[in-house]
């Protein structure tokens, strides 16, 4: 078969596995006269064998390892043995066969890492070699962790990355590795190869033994720092260090404070810089950070707990200019007249803040001195002595010493003497007849006017009056509000009236006054008042069971859903017709009778959720009355929206020619909802062409960087297609265009001739 | 550093169907588009078209429109191009090549023989 | 589709010779051409890209240039291992096409 397996001397390539015993023949050379013979050299390793009559083969099997390429040259000769055609090169390429399993470089390994390493962040590597063809699966290398010892829970503290042989810390390994509890672990590393997805693959093991060592960045106890420190400032109340010098150490106010008292130097010493005020902020609570030369972090901050410690630096303060009290002139010794209550801005429930009272001071001393008593902790007033006569003292003064530990502070306090209350009120009617009043009457209406006397002293608490009503309103919907001088009672209403539930009530009023009545007299009949109060139908709009409806669906929902109902009732039984009010985009339908919401068109969340409509139930029959609610629908996103860029990418460009290559920065987002993460979009050329020319890089989830690969650009516009694929379920791709200009600059501007200013670009890079 | 490993030779059938692979390795597989070459003696070098991985997105020749069909599985970083309908005149030899085409497979040698 | 026309078809020269190979386009393809060498075994490498941007790794006697429509690569010094094909790839616009190849021959 010419061609194939025979033919003439010429340059030829040959592929043969390693490790087959020959089978046939690699070539037949055919001579040209006057060549009659052929003779082989070059690395033929006593293997490849050229007959004279130009049979070319070998005679035992290859081995890749040992030679993966065997060079060889045939020469033609004449009958006198002299080269008439060649030496031409024939190459023998020595196909792999996985013969070789992978070893360890080491068979035991030893690492450390520390407490609370970042997860996924390598601190050691186990390397394994293959004499086979790394370009085949045969050397292509699978690393695997086989064991953990110990094993706590079941739960892997390290992994492995398959490819690479790096050994990290999991989530798991990073937050629970703890050396106090352990500390030290032993892994067991396979190796296979064959990519590890053959069973015929080959492997190895290797034991690694790692210390686990201690993480020192930790947070520091919290911190108590007395305030208004008079010592010079700043002062060192605490320190955090990293574990390896070199850290810059800074600290973040998550509070965005407008004074932050505290500062960190490169030691990782936290310094108070000014004096604190507890009554300003008594608790800061800010972080300290840890990061490399190139301003990266090196660990998650730490949170720093300072609590500033009280001083008595505050006196105590009275609640008012003057506290009035008023006091019955027959009270009776040990009566309460009123309680002081003095305040100190100095911490609750310390001796900073414990306030003591005492009298020091009555006016006048008639019929005597110490008429008074006040409680030394609970400042609350008694009557000390005989009881008071009005005609004799009205009023007396009383000064007042109120102290914490160190500070002391007068208050004043004014004591009304009053007539005893010894009058009940009296109603000037028992029975206020009968109202009657349709159920939408307003609510604030004044319905009723009713009216007592009191004969004590007037304008105090014995002589004022005070309304309750005590009978046949449990729904409170009435109320009594009174005026202070005429003591005259408005009786309002407060809720709704209702003829369904409550058609007739019958009202009891008491009267009664805010001071107590003197010992042996009671309120009798004459405080009482009745009334009955009659409520008449009208004919009422249905009532929705909730003022606002909300459902929630996904944005893809089929035309024809059930996305909600609604539900009303008439108050007089009637019979309820549903209807729809604002649904400007038409994507919902209401069944009338069940009130049940339908989606009749596709929904879309970008176009605003929640969707919000009214719903209208109206009676049917009768006066045909109706109501609102509203429905809010919120639309959960589905992935309905492609990437696209965030702004208009318009005026970017280049000054030509490029004296280097450059890059520009790009932002694109999408419609979508991105929850948490946000975006996690993914870049790459809109086709391979453009790949000669451009390169896009990912910066992160919503930016990209768009270089040249080169200088060599023509002076135009190039449009550059980029494909930004969301990642989404399902994936969207959106293929965008950024235009990038390659002009002469002028001042590190595009140059435009005259009369050639159109689109002028306006971004230089 | 990157390679294109591609399968071994075939010899097919007329009528029947095959797919070549190409596996990538030493770079982000998903970002670059791998292209797919044709090259038979006498006719030289063809584009056959392009894939992205990372999105399946694909443009092709028209000319090869219904004969090449282009995947990708990410998992195994691996380009596939089926070809259907077999004929003698695909015989050929079919390379791969990432966008920009500074790195080739060693190509995959396809014969078409009854 | 654009045509890459590509002369001459084979070129003898002797190591050491200057040599120039040309490619001409029927349509304005701006610089998006690249020069591909392939060696005898079918192993297929970049020598040039964006017409005259020389891959790394490539020796320096390999150069690209254009003029109009024709691109040029030139060999300023022949060594013994250039005496392979060569072809022209056009980027401008799809499909992507080729020259037809050049190969050059020891004299």
């Known amino acids: 078969q010419e061609g194939k397996f025979s033919g003439p001397l010429k340059p030829m390539t040959f592929s043969i596995y390693e490790g087959q015993e020959p089978s046939q023949i690699i070539f037949q050379f055919k001579a040209n006269p006057p060549a009659v013979t052929f003779e082989l050299t070059g690395e033929t390793d006593n293997i490849f064998v050229i007959e004279r009559e130009g049979l070319l083969y070998y005679n035992r099997a290859l081995d890749r390892e040992t030679r993966s390429t065997h060079n060889l040259q045939v020469a033609a000769l004449d009958a006198n043995g002299i080269i008439v055609e060649g030496p031409v090169p024939i190459t023998i390429k020595v196909k792999d066969i996985n013969d070789n399993r992978p070893t360890f470089l080491q068979s035991k390994y030893e690492g450390s890492v520390r407490q609370n390493s970042r997860p996924g962040k390598p601190f050691l590597y186990v390397n394994a070699t293959d004499l086979d063809d790394p370009a085949t699966p045969n050397g292509q290398l699978y690393y695997q962790i086989v064991i953990q010892l110990p094993m706590i829970n079941n739960v892997m503290y390290f992994q492995i990355n398959n490819k690479t042989g790096a050994i990290s810390l999991t989530r798991e390994g990073s937050q629970e590795l703890n050396p106090a509890k352990n500390p030290s672990y032993n892994l067991v590393i396979s190796v296979k190869d064959m990519g590890g997805q053959s069973e015929n693959s080959f492997s190895d093991t290797t034991s690694v033994d790692i210390i686990v060592t201690e993480n020192i960045w930790k947070a520091p106890k919290p911190v108590e720092m007395v305030e208004n420190s008079t010592d010079p400032h700043p002062i060192k109340i605490t320190q955090v260090r990293w574990n390896d010098p070199g850290a810059q150490y800074s600290l973040v106010d998550k509070e965005k404070l407008p004074r932050f008292p505290f500062s960190i130097d490169q030691e990782g010493d936290i310094y108070v810089t000014q004096p604190l005020d507890r009554e300003e902020k008594d608790a800061y609570v800010f972080y300290a950070v840890a990061k490399d030369e190139y301003g990266k972090p090196l660990s998650y901050p730490l949170e720093i707990h300072v609590k500033v410690k009280d001083i008595n630096d505050n006196p105590p303060t009275c609640p008012s200019p003057v506290t009035v009290f008023e006091v019955q002139e027959n009270e009776r010794l040990g009566n309460s007249i009123g309680t002081l209550t003095a305040h100190d801005r100095d911490e609750e429930n310390t001796a900073n803040s414990f306030l003591n009272y005492r009298i020091v001071e009555q006016t006048p001393k008639l019929p005597m001195d110490g008429l008074f008593l006040i409680q030394t902790y609970a400042g609350m007033l008694q009557l000390a002595k005989q009881s008071l006569k009005k005609q004799d003292t009205p009023q007396y003064n009383l000064t007042i010493e109120v102290s914490d530990k160190d500070f002391k502070t007068l208050c004043f306090v004014q004591i009304n003497v009053i007539d005893i209350n010894d009058q009940i009120p009296i109603f000037e009617k028992s029975d206020y007849g009968n109202l009657t009043l349709a159920e939408d009457t307003n609510i604030g209406s004044t319905i009723l006017t009713i009216q007592a006397t009191d004969a004590d002293e007037p304008f105090t608490g014995s002589s004022k009056i005070l309304y309750h009503i005590i009978k046949g309103d449990s729904e409170g919907r009435l109320g009594v509000d009174t005026d202070p001088h005429t003591n005259t009672g408005y009786v309002i209403i407060k809720k709704p009236l209702d003829f369904e539930t409550a058609a007739v009530s019958n009202i009891v009023f008491k009267a009664e006054n805010p001071e107590p009545l003197v010992f042996g007299v009671k309120y009798n009949a004459s405080s009482f008042a009745k009334f009955t109060l009659i409520v008449t139908d009208v004919n009422e709009a249905p009532q929705f069971s909730q003022h606002v409806f909300q459902a929630k669906v996904s944005e893809d929902v089929a035309i024809g859903t059930k996305v909600g109902n609604v539900t009303a009732k008439d108050p007089e039984g009637l019979d309820i017709s549903y209807s729809l009010r604002g649904d400007t985009r038409g994507w919902l339908k209401i069944d009338h009778v069940t009130g049940e919401i339908f989606s009749v068109a596709p929904l879309d969340r970008e176009a605003g959720s929640p969707y919000r409509v009214q719903v209208v139930a109206t009676e049917v029959g009768g006066s045909s009355l109706s109501s609102v609610s509203e429905f809010h629908l919120i639309l959960m996103d589905v992935n309905d929206n492609p990437p696209r860029l965030a702004k208009d990418y318009t005026g970017l460009f280049f000054c030509h020619p490029l004296s280097a290559p450059g890059s520009l920065i790009f932002e694109a987002t999408d419609d979508d909802q991105h929850l948490f993460r946000g975006p996690h979009f993914t870049f790459s050329l809109g086709s391979g062409s453009l790949q000669n020319d451009w390169e896009v890089s990912k910066i992160n989830g919503t930016h990209a960087r768009l270089s040249t690969r080169h200088t060599e650009f023509e002076e135009r516009e190039y449009v550059v297609l980029i494909r930004i694929n969301d990642g989404g379920r399902p994936p969207l791709e959106g293929i965008v265009s950024l235009p990038v200009t390659f002009c002469s600059c002028v001042e590190g501007s595009c140059f435009r001739p005259a009369g050639h200013q159109t689109g002028i670009p306006t971004v230089g890079m | 550093q990157v390679q294109l490993q591609q399968s071994g030779a075939e010899l097919m059938k007329p009528g029947a169907s095959v797919k070549l692979s190409c596996k990538a390795t030493g770079y982000t597989f998903t970002g670059y588009w791998i292209e797919w070459i044709k090259q038979r003696p006498g006719h030289g070098l063809e584009w056959i078209g392009e894939i992205l991985p990372g999105s399946g997105s694909t443009n092709y020749n028209e000319k090869f429109k219904g004969k090449a069909t282009f995947t990708a599985d990410t998992s195994s970083n691996t380009a596939y191009m089926e070809l259907s309908s077999l004929t003698t005149e695909d015989s050929a030899i079919y390379y791969c090549a990432r966008a920009g085409y500074n790195n080739w497979g060693q190509g995959t040698t396809l014969t078409v023989s009854s | 589709d654009i045509q890459m026309t590509q002369s001459p078809s084979s070129l003898s020269a002797s190591l050491g010779e200057r040599v120039s190979l040309t490619c001409r386009a029927s349509?304005?393809?701006?610089?998006?051409v690249n020069w591909l060498q392939q060696e005898p075994d079918g192993t297929i490498k970049r020598l040039i890209y964006a017409t005259s941007s020389l891959e790394s790794g490539v020796p320096k006697r390999f150069s690209g240039s254009r003029s109009g429509s024709d691109y040029f690569l030139t060999i300023s010094s022949l060594e013994s291992e250039d005496f392979v094909d060569y072809y022209c790839l056009q980027y401008a616009s799809s499909p992507l096409t080729f020259g037809a190849g050049t190969k050059l021959e020891l004299k």
């Open positions: 349509q304005d393809i701006g610089r998006s």
